[in-house]
């Protein structure tokens, strides 16, 4: 099974995305019909166990010898992987302050809905993206970023917060999802796996990528995050998959080279300002979009997720540095810090390009299963 390819005359090569049928009919993924990762019963928030068994056996995809993000999602093969009884690495720990239920963690107690009831909501993130079910929305225009090229001073805080590495961004980074949909960037952080284990949060037809970057934004309609939580469109996250490539990514190296300084949980350092947009794919025109939630407690909903079709390339050494440098709580490595994919529950993922069109010889007619819901279409 291959992700669909776009027409060869497509300027940037093609894309893939995928979605659950909002009607919940036979196109809804089940354990049998797609290699997507299913959530273990009653364990919405355990990463690893829902990880596609044997994903490390997926064929390696060699990037095209172009620029940083020349690999597109539709270039990735997906395979039915055999069952793998191996337990995921457990990066859990015992809370240092007893049974305080506010101390959430990956891969164990307390259940996230006990930490925050919103984590049991119906429209949670991350999700599995299925290309054939994405709704092409021509109204989704290229993203606009302004002020993302930061000068070296003032320096920025890079912190190991125990569940990710986070770069706090200064005021002035403006992003627009479209006319009247304006946001300010607040922070960025990463999600990753472990040696031989991918760790992206979103998946594409069940394929989990090595890592994922999230740039979190606040709507200009709100002054503070606490006012925007749970409000539709109050927060927006730009997400991109990180993929292995042949060359070192110089933009990421500015952060990765500093991870040793913050190996210990809670530690922080100051790093010179950098071009934040260089951490993202270069193609701002092809992406998937849906409404979901924060992927960590409090799991507030109403978050607009924009997942780039193009991936970002890091060297194997850089990906190893990311997944093997930081320490989390309880003397455990900070690894596998991703949430299980969550059910769509009728949501349709929209695509800014015809991601669901299959131009391979076997498809006589392009098929688009879902209609665009965007205003103006």
């Amino acid at each position: 099974q291959r992700l669909p390819r776009m027409q060869e005359d497509s300027p940037l090569g093609g894309g893939s995305s995928g979605e659950d049928d909002p009607l919940g009919e036979e196109d809804l993924p089940s354990e049998e019909d797609s290699p997507r990762e299913e959530d273990p019963p009653g364990e919405e928030d355990l990463p690893g166990e829902e990880d596609l068994p044997g994903e490390e056996d997926l064929p390696e995809v060699k990037p095209k010898s172009e620029e940083e993000g020349s690999l597109k999602l539709e270039d990735l093969p997906t395979v039915e992987a055999p069952g793998d009884p191996q337990e995921p690495q457990n990066n859990a720990h015992r809370d240092k302050e007893g049974d305080d239920q506010s101390h959430w963690r990956y891969g164990g107690d307390p259940p996230w809905p006990r930490v925050s009831p919103a984590c049991a909501g119906r429209f949670q993130s991350p999700v599995d993206i299925r290309p054939q079910l994405a709704a092409f929305c021509p109204a989704l225009r290229p993203l606009e970023l302004l002020g993302f090229q930061l000068p070296p001073l003032p320096e920025l805080r890079l912190r190991n917060n125990g569940h990710s590495v986070q770069l706090t961004l200064p005021p002035g980074l403006e992003m627009a999802l479209g006319p009247g949909r304006e946001y300010r960037a607040l922070q960025l952080h990463l999600h990753w796996g472990a040696a031989g284990r991918p760790g992206s949060e979103h998946t594409v037809e069940g394929h989990r990528f090595p890592a994922e970057i999230h740039v979190v934004h606040l709507s200009t309609a709100f002054a503070r995050v606490d006012e925007a939580l749970g409000r539709p469109g109050g927060l927006a996250v730009l997400a991109a998959f990180l993929e292995e490539g042949p060359e070192e990514n110089s933009a990421y190296e500015q952060l990765l080279s500093r991870l040793e300084e913050i190996a210990e949980e809670g530690s922080e350092t100051q790093v010179p300002g950098l071009d934040i947009s260089a951490l993202l794919p270069s193609d701002f025109s092809r992406y998937f979009q849906y409404e979901g939630s924060l992927t960590t407690p409090p799991c507030a909903q109403g978050v607009i997720w924009t997942v780039f079709n193009q991936t970002v390339m890091l060297s194997a050494k850089q990906l190893h540095t990311l997944s093997d440098t930081l320490w989390g709580p309880g003397d455990s490595r900070l690894q596998l810090n991703f949430r299980a994919t969550q059910p769509l529950n009728g949501r349709v993922i929209e695509a800014s390009f015809p991601a669901g069109v299959d131009s391979s010889p076997r498809a006589a007619e392009p098929v688009q299963l879902n209609s665009c819901l965007a205003a103006g279409d």
Partner: nanobody
Framework: QVQLQESGGGLVQPGGSRRLSCAAS???????????VAWYRQAPGKQRELVAV???????KYSDSVKGRFTISRDSAKNTVLLQMNSLKPEDTAVYYC????????WGQGTQVTVSS
């Protein structure tokens, strides 16, 4: 709108103790349950420096200058974060600020701690 308020500052003799409190108010969200919370301090003419931080997992980290003397703790039920300061030294004199990293930075107004005989 969430607001942070520090309290507990004042004049203390060298070798003495003080407990600072950071309280969050103004929103139903229990911000300290989901934020890494830190105490920073700034002495006159110096840069603001990290003193202690407690993460969402309950992990704690201290600057070398206060390790073994200061303890940070969180009471999520009361929505407060405490900084217990023991064996205070004159060089601990500074304005102490509470910071909550909750997708964005929230800061308090600061409380003055003066260590002097």
């Amino acid at each position: 709108q969430v607001q942070l308020q520090e309290s507990g500052g004042g004049l203390v003799q060298p070798g003495g103790s003080r407990r600072l409190s950071c309280a969050a108010s103004g929103n139903s969200v229990n911000i300290f349950s989901f934020a890494a919370v830190a105490w920073y301090r700034q002495a006159p003419g110096k840069q603001r420096e990290l003193v202690a931080v407690i993460t969402t997992t309950g992990g704690t980290k201290y600057s070398d200058s206060v390790k073994g003397r200061f303890t940070i703790s969180r009471d999520s039920a009361k929505n407060t974060v405490l900084l217990q300061m023991n064996s205070l030294k004159p060089e601990d004199t500074a304005v102490y600020y509470c910071n909550a990293d909750y997708l964005q930075d929230y800061w308090g107004q600061g409380t003055q701690v003066t260590v002097s005989s």
